[in-house]
Interface confidence: low
């Protein structure tokens, strides 16, 4: 098949692959009918004039993971059929003007993971058919006005992981077909009003891991097709009242890792499609009535690791489709009995690592589908009679690391726990904290006769009586907090991966799906 360089492999499908450290220049002669050429992991440092002159049928050219630092302006001459060009993972600092001239069919241009210091309007002025431009992982400090003006067909632009400190409001104005814009991991402190106004078809906007302190009220008002908005790990301390008002298609919004102190009613929405709202690691202290009431399709609400001490009874109004509610690691002391009343489809709730002293008997009254409840590491001494009776699907209940008061009032709870031991898991069981003579003993098998009797007459338990168990040897109370944690780590180079990870067998509330961007 028309000759294949010895350092390359050539398939009958006109695909050529050249790899290896011994390659220091573009191999020759390349088969004239090659349609795909990959030059990977070589020691090529420069591309000279027209090394691909005789393979004009080439459609895809990948020159990746090399030592490439210099390219002659005419390097890609005669590649008029080229649709895909990747120069990613090289050592390019400068692109010569006119490098992409004549590449009239080019649709994808990957320049990511180089050391580019600047781009100019003239670089891409000939690339009128370009649909994808990847510039992430470079050293760009600013984007000049006009840089993308000729790329009217562009649908995906990645500028993440650069050193951008500001963006001109005009730089994206001609990109009316853009669907994905990624600006994550830069040094942006604010985004001027109007920056995204021309992006009427935008579906994903990634702004996470910048230093944005303030969002302009109308920043997203023209982006009616936006589906994913990543604002996590910035310095946002407040949300303007109308900032999310015109996002009817949004289905994922990440705001974790900011400095939000309060959420005002109506701030979210109306967003008929929003499925996930990530708000952990902020400074939120209270949740007012109706704060999420516009989010009728919300399924995942993560509010953990804030400073929430008060939740208004109507805070979760409207969240009829919510499946997962994470409130762990906050400062809750009390909960209103009606606070979860509207959450008819809730399956998992995490309330661990708070300061809850008691729970109202009707707290889970309407939430019949609950499968997992995390209540460990609170200040609970007892629980109301029958609090879990109606929860037929409950398969996971964590109650350890609470100061259970094992007097005769604890009997109904102890009997219920005895019958439902599998739901408690085998790792850590709840133990008595008081009276002193039973401290450290398992709540489930404690002999309540040994404990100090309560002054009140206990109610008749609604659970069947269970046999008494003799005393068991005391063992130290384990006070280590084994809390559910949300970890964030990048997936590929543009993602908010938000995995709620579990440290024991709490896999149901482990939110096994990775929330990736």
């Amino acid at each position: 098949y028309h000759g294949c360089p010895s350092e390359c492999t050539c398939s009958r499908a006109s695909q050529v692959e050249c790899t290896g450290a011994r390659i220091v220049a573009v191999p020759t002669p390349l088969p004239w009918n090659a349609m795909s050429l990959q030059i990977l992991n070589t020691h090529i440092t420069e591309l000279n004039e027209s090394p691909f002159l005789n393979i004009s049928a080439l459609i895809a050219l990948r020159i990746e993971k090399n030592e490439l630092s210099r390219i002659t302006p005419g390097a890609f001459r005669n590649l008029g059929s080229l649709r895909y060009l990747s120069l990613a993972n090289n050592k390019l600092q400068v692109l010569p003007i006119g490098l992409f001239q004549g590449l009239d069919s080019l649709e994808s241009l990957l320049l990511s993971s180089n050391q580019l210091l600047q781009i100019q309007p003239a670089h891409f002025s000939q690339c009128s058919n370009l649909k994808e431009l990847q510039l992430h992982g470079n050293h760009l400090e600013y984007i000049p006005d006009g840089a993308f003006d000729h790329l009217v067909g562009l649908t995906k632009l990645n500028l993440g992981k650069n050193s951008l400190t500001h963006i001109s409001p005009r730089v994206f104005q001609h990109l009316g077909n853009l669907q994905v814009l990624r600006l994550y991991e830069n040094r942006l402190t604010d985004i001027p009003m109007g920056t995204f106004d021309g992006l009427v078809n935008l579906q994903e906007l990634a702004l996470q891991q910048n230093q944005i302190g303030l969002l302009s009220p109308g920043l997203f008002h023209n982006n009616h097709n936006l589906q994913r908005l990543y604002l996590s790990n910035n310095h946002i301390s407040q949300l303007p009242p109308s900032v999310f008002m015109q996002l009817p298609q949004l289905n994922r919004l990440t705001l974790f890792g900011n400095s939000l102190k309060e959420l005002s009613p109506g701030i979210f929405g109306p967003m008929p499609n929003l499925r996930e709202l990530w708000l952990y690691d902020n400074h939120i202290s209270s949740l007012p009535d109706n704060v999420f009431s516009n989010l009728r399709q919300l399924q995942v609400l993560i509010l953990s690791r804030n400073q929430i001490s008060f939740i208004s009874p109507g805070a979760f109004n409207g969240l009829t489709e919510l499946r997962e509610l994470s409130l762990h690691t906050n400062a809750l002391q009390d909960l209103d009995g009606n606070v979860f009343r509207m959450l008819a489809n809730l399956q998992n709730i995490s309330l661990q690592n708070n300061r809850l002293r008691q729970l109202p008997g009707n707290i889970f009254a309407n939430v019949n589908g609950l499968m997992a409840i995390q209540l460990q590491n609170n200040q609970l001494e007892n629980l109301p009679l029958g609090i879990f009776d109606h929860l037929g699907k409950l398969c996971e209940l964590r109650l350890y690391d609470n100061p259970w008061r094992c007097d005769s009032d604890i009997l109904p709870l102890r009997n219920w726990l005895l019958l439902n031991q599998p739901r408690l898991g085998t790792d850590t069981v709840p133990v008595c904290f008081s009276p002193a003579n039973v401290r450290g003993q398992s709540l489930i098998i404690i002999n309540v006769n040994v404990a100090v009797p309560s002054v009140h007459v206990p109610e008749v338990p609604s659970y069947p009586e269970t046999p008494w168990y003799p005393d068991t040897p005391s063992y130290p109370d384990t006070t280590s907090v084994s809390s559910t944690t949300e970890l964030t780590s990048p997936v590929e180079d543009y993602t908010d991966l938000t995995t709620i990870q579990v440290t024991d067998d709490r896999s149901v509330w482990g939110m096994t799906q990775a929330q990736s961007g």
Epitope: S242, M245, P248, P270, Q297
Partner: antibody, heavy 119, light 111 residues
Framework: QVQLVQSGAEVKKPGSSVKVSCKAS????????ISWVRQAPGQGLEWMGG????????NYAQKFQGRVTITADESTSTAYMELSSLRSEDTAVYYC????????????WGQGTLVTVSS | QSALTQPASVSGSPGQSITISCTGT?????????VSWYQQHPGKAPKLMIY???NRPSGVSNRFSGSKSGNTASLTISGLQAEDEADYYC???????????FGGGTKLTVL
């Protein structure tokens, strides 16, 4: 009680423009959305576009894009709909309607303005 | 042609129940719980009867109820009365170029 009062009937020549007003009273004007819906004689309802005065950015149905302009004046609690390049098939009753949000439902309607396009 | 499909007419006798259907796609009716129903008497502006599939605004009789299954929404009027005779329109939020789509309307005749 919320009320939407529209301007009076208009007769226009083909190719000209018409501007219909809708004055709101009895509620917060800025934070609600005003939509414009038209109804040709003997026909159904057709959404043209909407605006939330607080934001100022209108949204238009694709069919009317480029021909309709919707604006709002917060100081007078009045919304406007201007339709240009009129043709005979634009003869219709034009309603303004208020909703919590232009995507959802319209709980208050104006009385309607008949626009007749005839040469 | 309207984006949502309704029967052109339905009829019923006083006291009876009738149902008007409204069929769309997964981009409108099927995709969201944002279906509304309006009643319109001749020469009058439409009046909101049902919003968000099944909610009734205050002042609307509980004889009017709404539901949805898949891509089809329905309006049911029980205990038909003479004043129910009117045109009825369904409307949905739409994941398309138009944010709002209406049905073609159904003329209800009370016999």
């Amino acid at each position: 009680q919320v009320q939407l009062v529209q301007s009076g009937a208009e007769v226009k020549k083909p190719g000209s423009s018409v501007k219909v007003s809708c004055k709101a009273s009895g509620g917060t004007f800025s934070t609600y959305a005003i939509s414009w819906v038209r109804q040709a004689p003997g026909q159904g309802l057709e959404w043209m576009g909407g605006i939330t005065p607080m934001f100022g950015t209108p949204n238009y149905a694709q069919k009317f894009q480029g021909r309709v302009t919707i604006t709002a004046d917060e100081s007078t609690s009045t919304a406007y709909m201007e339709l240009s390049s009129l043709r005979s098939e634009d003869t219709a009753v034009y309603y303004c309607a208020r909703g919590d949000w232009y995507d959802y439902h319209f709980d208050y309607w104006g009385q309607g303005t008949l626009v007749t396009v005839s040469s | 042609q309207s984006a949502l499909t309704q029967p052109a007419s339905v009829s019923g006798s006083p006291g009876q129940s009738i149902t008007i259907s409204c069929t769309g796609t997964s981009s409108d009716v099927g995709g969201y719980n944002y279906v509304s129903w309006y009643q319109q008497h001749p020469g009058k502006a439409p009046k909101l009867m049902i919003y968000e599939v099944s909610n009734r605004p205050s002042g609307v009789s509980n004889r009017f109820s709404g539901s949805k299954s898949g891509n089809t929404a329905s309006l049911t009027i029980s205990g038909l009365q003479a004043e129910d005779e009117a045109d009825y329109y369904c409307q949905s939020y739409a994941n398309r170029d138009n944010f709002v789509v209406f049905g073609g309307g159904t003329k209800l005749t009370v016999l």
